[in-house]
Amino acid sequence: LEVSESPGSIQVARGQPAVLPCTFTTSAALINLNVIWMVTPLSNANQPEQVILYQGGQMFDGAPRFHGRVGFTGTMPATNVSIFINNTQLSDTGTYQCLVNNLPDIGGRNIGVTGLTVLVPPSAPHCQIQGSQDIGSDVILLCSSEEGIPRPTYLWEKLDNTLKLPPTATQDQVQGTVTIRNISALSSGLYQCVASNAIGTSTCLLDLQVISPQPRNIG
């Protein structure tokens, strides 16, 4: 019995279906086919879980969280024992193993391994201002998404016709910050933060209002 090499890893957007491949060759009839799919979740590597089981001509559910979402892609028994996972969740990310036994065929490689990564687009980022908005001050524009896999990068723009940040601004696209030094009236306006990763983008807008000093009456 020989389980075929599978692609190292599969990436899928959260909520979309994933197909985890596993095929094998055997010299025996498929009368005593026994297939166990296991997962070692990334979130809990010490706790492997059963995903689905085929034994004695019957299918059995694995861990409750997979109930109703998992099945074999083809009619069993077969030499293609790939499975699908519908409505993928972040917690489905992990290393999946198919363990195949087909007595009396023994020996050879009977395990196939596939990594599954569930990707999540950036959630609506939160835009905020840190620091005094008085003229001449330094301010930091902050942008962060609570969710996003891979980790989002952040691009700030000023929504004027140049789409450029003020000349005194420095941007950190990893941290999602823009530091604007010595703000002036020209720094005022609408700023856009675009959070993006491999599968999506999301934005927030921020309204920076630079406060000019009030003229004092000399009396």
Partner: antibody, heavy 123, light 110 residues
Framework: QVQLQESGPGLVKPSQTLSLTCTVS??????????WSWIRQHPGKGLEWIGY???????YYNPSLKSRVTISVDTSKNQFSLKLSSVTAADTAVYYC???????????????WGQGTLVTVSS | QSVLTQPPSASGTPGQRVTISCSGS????????VNWYQQLPGTAPKLLIS???NRPSGVPDRFSGSKSGTSASLAITGLQAEDEADYYC???????????FGGGTKLTVL
């Protein structure tokens, strides 16, 4: 409560420049946090954002119209204006001025709007 | 052609519940908030729903908004004759870096 009122010619010849003014009453155009916008509605069709101006004079235009649009502000008159050059029949529309503000939102909204003025481009 | 897609018309009888859909893409509705405007005959559009599901003061609670994925919808319960109007959805488009609208839905109260 802020109110907006558009004014300007209702008929413009092709290739000429469309000019409209929006007068703001019930509040100051120099109030921070408001972006004074122009939006148009072609006959029987949807709405199209044209651009905005901040009281400081900073402008931002719809990229599809950017080459022909100029928006300016006159804080002393509490007015802002739209100029659209090289007009064609496709620019025939009802033109609205509106105030956009971010509020506590991620993306803001337009409120209030002027009552709109129909501009026809025809020779 | 509008960036956001709405059905051109919808109708209902007084007291009925009517929904108006608004379909977009991942760069607008999919990742940003949606506003709805009501345009009564011969008047300017008026903000009806902001931030997907918030009603400004003065808007009856018969109007509600929702958003799922790249689509949004406006629901009107207990339809009344004065609800006959054009309804527009609007969002921000991250790719265009600008505000986009739907083509509008004309609601007729039968």
């Amino acid at each position: 409560q802020v109110q907006l009122q558009e004014s300007g010619p209702g008929l413009v010849k092709p290739s000429q420049t469309l000019s409209l003014t929006c007068t703001v009453s019930g509040g100051s155009i120099s109030s921070g946090g408001y972006y004074w916008s122009w939006i148009r509605q072609h006959p029987g069709k949807g709405l199209e954002w044209i651009g905005y101006i901040y009281y400081s004079g900073s402008t931002y235009y719809n990229p599809s119209l950017k080459s022909r649009v100029t928006i300016s502000v006159d804080t002393s008159k509490n007015q802002f204006s739209l100029k659209l050059s090289s007009v064609t029949a496709a620019d025939t529309a009802v033109y609205y001025c509106a105030s956009w503000s971010l509020g506590t939102s991620n993306h803001g909204w337009f409120d209030p709007w002027g009552q709109g003025t129909l501009v026809t481009v025809s020779s | 052609q509008s960036v956001l897609t709405q059905p051109p018309s919808a109708s209902g009888t007084p007291g009925q519940r009517v929904t108006i859909s608004c379909s977009g893409s991942s760069s607008n509705i999919g990742s940003n908030t949606v506003n709805w405007y009501q345009q009564l005959p011969g008047t300017a559009p008026k903000l009806l729903i902001s931030d997907n599901n918030n009603r400004p003061s003065g808007v009856p609670d018969r109007f509600s908004g929702s958003k799922s994925g790249t689509s949004a919808s406006l629901a009107i319960t207990g339809l009344q004759a004065e609800d006959e109007a054009d309804y527009y959805c609007q969002s921000y488009d991250s790719n265009l870096s600008g505000w986009v609208f739907g083509g509008g839905t004309k609601l007729t109260v039968l």
